[in-house]
Structure formats: C-alpha cells, structure tokens
C-alpha cells in the first residue's frame, strides 16, 4: 500500500526522486566504461516520516516501532521502488560490448 | 551482485536480521487483530559501508557517491531483501479470518 | 580464419517474412557484440540494431516491432528476422563485427560481403 | 532517436589536397563515432574508431576529431585510392541504445 504522498516536513524534504550528477572517475568505472562519460544518477533520497510512501506492511511495523524504541529500531528508509535500465559501452576481455544493467537508475522511491 | 559479508565495524554492527517483540498495541493493531497477540517482528538494522551487502549496481553508486558527496547523497540503507509471510487471525465485518502477509516479516537484509 | 556470411536473401513480396543468417567463424559469439547494416541501392548506409555478446538485444527505432534479431552460439550463427516487409526494405544487408564505433581486439573491419534482399510484387 | 548529420554531401577535391569531412550529432555521444569508408560493390572499412583512433592497416593521411555533438574527418593529403563514399555512424547509449549513419560525403575528384 503507498500511503499518503503528503510531506509533513515541508516540500521537497520527504524520500523522493533526486538527480545527481555524476563521472565515471566519480563512480569508479573508469577502468572498464567507455560510455556514457557521465551519468545522471536518479536515486532515493529524504525522509521518512509515519506513513509517508510506506511501501508494505513492514515499512509500518518500523514506523510504530521506531516511533516506541527509537534507539533500537530506526525509521523507514528512502529506497527505489523500481528501476530504470542503462546502457553502458563497456570493455570486455575481447574488446567492447553494449551491456544493459537493470537495476542502476532508480524510476521511483517508497519508504521501508 | 551480494557483496562483503564482513563487517568492518565489528561483529553485530553492520546490515543483518534483527528480532523485536512487540505486543498488539505497539504495532497499533489491537482493534483489528486477534492472533498472535505478540510478534516477533524480524527486521533488518544495522550500518551498510562501503560494498557490505550491495543489493545492485545502484547500492555501489550510492556507496560511491555517498564517499564523494556525504551531505548530498546518504549512505546506503538496511532493508529486507526478502520476506517470510505471517499468519493473523483478524476481524472482519462477519466475524473473524485468517489471512496471510507476505511483506510482514524480513527474512534476510541488503544494503540498498 | 575470422569470417562473416550472410545468407538467406532473394526475393520476397511485399507484407512476407524473411530470415538472414550470418555465420561466423574464427570466434565465438558469446564474446563479441554482432551489428547488421542495411544499404539501398544506390543509397546510404543504415543502422538496424546489435546483439551483444550477452544477447541483449538494442535496435533503431524504425527497425523495432519488424525486424528481431538473434543468435544460436552453437551454431556460430546471428540471424535477422524480417516481418511485414515493405519495398523500402529493398538492400543489401551486411552482418559486421563489434559495435563498430569502438574497435575490438584483433581484426578491426569485420564485415560480410552482404545478401540482397528485394522486396517486390 | 539519434540523427547524425554530414557535410557537405559532395566534396570536390584535387590529389595531393586536403579534405575535411564534418559529422554533427543530436544528442551528446561523447566520443562514440566512428568513420567508414566505402566504395562501389564493397562492405565498408574501418578507418576510425572511438572518434580519433586510426583503425589498423590505414594510412596515417586519415585523422579524426571531435567529440559529443561535433565530428571531423581529415584526409591530409588525398591519393587517388581516397575518392570514396565516407560515412560516420554514432552510437548513444543511456536507457538504451541506438545508432545511426550519417547520410555520406561522397569525395570526388575536382
């Protein structure tokens, strides 16, 4: 269940979608990418407060218990829902393939 | 790609599969379900540094982009990887059922 | 000897299916990336797609929903599956090695000599 | 989708003379270009790859530059052998992939 989409802390500051601008000498792949030079890194940050975009019943379980033990059980976390893929040119033992990674780009965010 | 089991913070520290007790009235279910009256909820808590547990190629971003950019991009998260179901005898508007949740209880943890 | 050849051309009517082969040999398939080129007579050349080493497929955008293209490792073979054809689809079709914009090791000009397709009532 | 564009489509050029090819992108392809060269009844070949890099086996006549959206091709000195069809291809990789040839420059004796 995607419970409410309301940000109770003020726009922007709850678990959403952010670009970040990033090389391959950021990203360390330097080495072994040829392609993109640079990467528009879409990834999950903000936060987590009670019910916002809980993405199963255990996002609401940690919601209840950390609000109880908030030093024991810390508040849901900002991560991706779903993927984009990406393509990247890479070197290979041969030379150069095309490999596509399912799992790099975040598409959208939930709380858990 | 499930990387580093070894944690460099010590033993217990780092992303692994925790148990809290908690009663009806700490998950706020009290009013609509009868059994169990307490849960061991299994929950995933802990540090994820660098490459320890990296769910995906996004996780070893974030690790990456978190060592660049610590105030912009965070640290990777502990979260389920996979979920053991969970039986409740709830109350219904004809009485009682029972029903299965499969998103109730971690089953093991990854760092994402 | 590192070789390419493309067979399966002729002539087809307009709305049939064709499948090109292109059978290669001096390397595996499960290491090197497989691009087809198409070129009309007496016009230019045209991307059509690439099947990587992992088989992961990638096309232009003209060519997606038409044409599929495959591989049989085993056989040493890529194949390029042509539906609901067009007179427009009238070419010769080369299988070449690679992903063309960046060189592998080894041979850096690996092309087939082509197969004519011709589309026509 | 990728367009890449060439100019001029028709150079006229003496032997021994310079020729500059230019290839522009659509989208930023950084240096994923190469450069062909074709001739009557034959595949293309190879002269430059990775936007600059001499393919093995050609003359050191043939130099490439460029990279994102702008491309060039030289032929320092032109041989007879050089007056050709030439083509760039371009690949842009992000959520997918997909190339695209330039329309050609034919080089043809002045």
């Known amino acids: 269940a995607r419970n409410g989409d309301h940000c109770p802390l003020g726009p922007g500051r709850c678990c959403r979608l952010h670009t970040v601008r990033a090389s391959l000498e950021d990203l360390g792949w330097a080495d072994w990418v040829l392609s993109p030079r640079e990467v528009q890194v879409t990834m999950c940050i903000g936060a987590c407060p009670s019910q916002f975009r809980a993405a199963n019943m255990h996002a609401q379980i940690k919601t209840s218990l950390h609000r109880l033990k908030p030093d024991t059980v810390p508040a849901p976390c900002c991560v991706p829902a779903s993927y984009n893929p990406m393509v990247l040119i890479q070197k290979t033992d041969t030379g150069v393939s095309l490999q596509t990674y399912d799992d790099l780009l975040a598409k959208d965010c939930h709380c858990i | 790609a499930r990387n580093g089991d070894h944690c460099p913070l010590g033993p217990g520290r780092c992303c692994r599969l925790h148990t809290v007790r908690a009663s009806l009235e700490d998950l706020g279910w009290a009013d609509w379900v009868l059994s169990p009256r307490e849960v061991q909820v299994t929950m995933c808590i802990g540090a994820c540094p660098s490459q320890f547990r990296a769910a995906n190629m996004h996780a070893q971003i974030k690790t990456s982009l978190h060592r660049l950019k610590p105030d912009t991009v965070p640290a990777p998260c502990c979260v389920p990887a996979s979920y053991n179901p969970m039986v409740l005898i709830q109350k219904t508007d004809t009485g009682v059922s029972l029903q299965t949740y499969d998103d109730l209880l971690a089953k093991d943890c990854h760092c994402i | 000897e590192v070789q390419l050849l493309e067979s399966g051309g002729g002539l087809v009517q307009p709305g049939g299916s064709l499948r090109l082969s292109c059978a290669v040999s001096g390397f595996s398939l499960s290491s090197y990336d497989m691009t087809w080129v198409r070129q009309a007579p007496g016009k230019g050349l045209e991307w059509i797609g690439i099947i990587s080493n992992s088989g992961s497929t990638y096309y232009a955008s003209w060519a997606k929903g038409r044409f599929t293209i495959s591989k049989d490792s085993s056989k040493n073979t890529v194949y390029l599956q042509m539906n609901s054809l067009r007179a427009e689809d009238t070419a010769v079709y080369f299988c070449?090695?690679?992903?063309?914009?960046?060189?592998?090791?080894?041979?850096?000009?690996?092309w087939g000599q082509g197969t004519l397709v011709t589309v026509s009532s | 989708d990728i367009v890449m564009t060439q100019s001029p489509a028709t150079l006229s050029v003496s032997p021994g003379e310079r020729a500059t090819l230019s290839c522009q992108a659509s989208e930023d392809i950084y240096t994923n270009l190469a450069w062909f060269q074709q001739k009557p009844g034959q595949p293309p070949r190879l002269l430059i790859y990775?936007?600059?890099t001499l393919a093995s086996g050609i003359p050191a006549r043939f130099s490439g530059s460029g990279s994102g959206t702008e491309f060039t091709l030289t032929i320092s000195s032109l041989q007879s052998e050089d007056f050709a069809v030439y083509y760039c291809?371009?690949?842009?990789?992000?959520?997918?992939?997909?190339?695209?040839f330039g329309q050609g420059t034919k080089v043809e004796i002045k």
């Open positions: 070449a090695r690679g992903i063309l914009v960046y060189a592998d090791y080894g041979d850096h000009n690996l």
């Open positions: 291809l371009g690949v842009y990789t992000y959520i997918s992939a997909e190339g695209a």
């Open positions: 990775a936007a600059s």
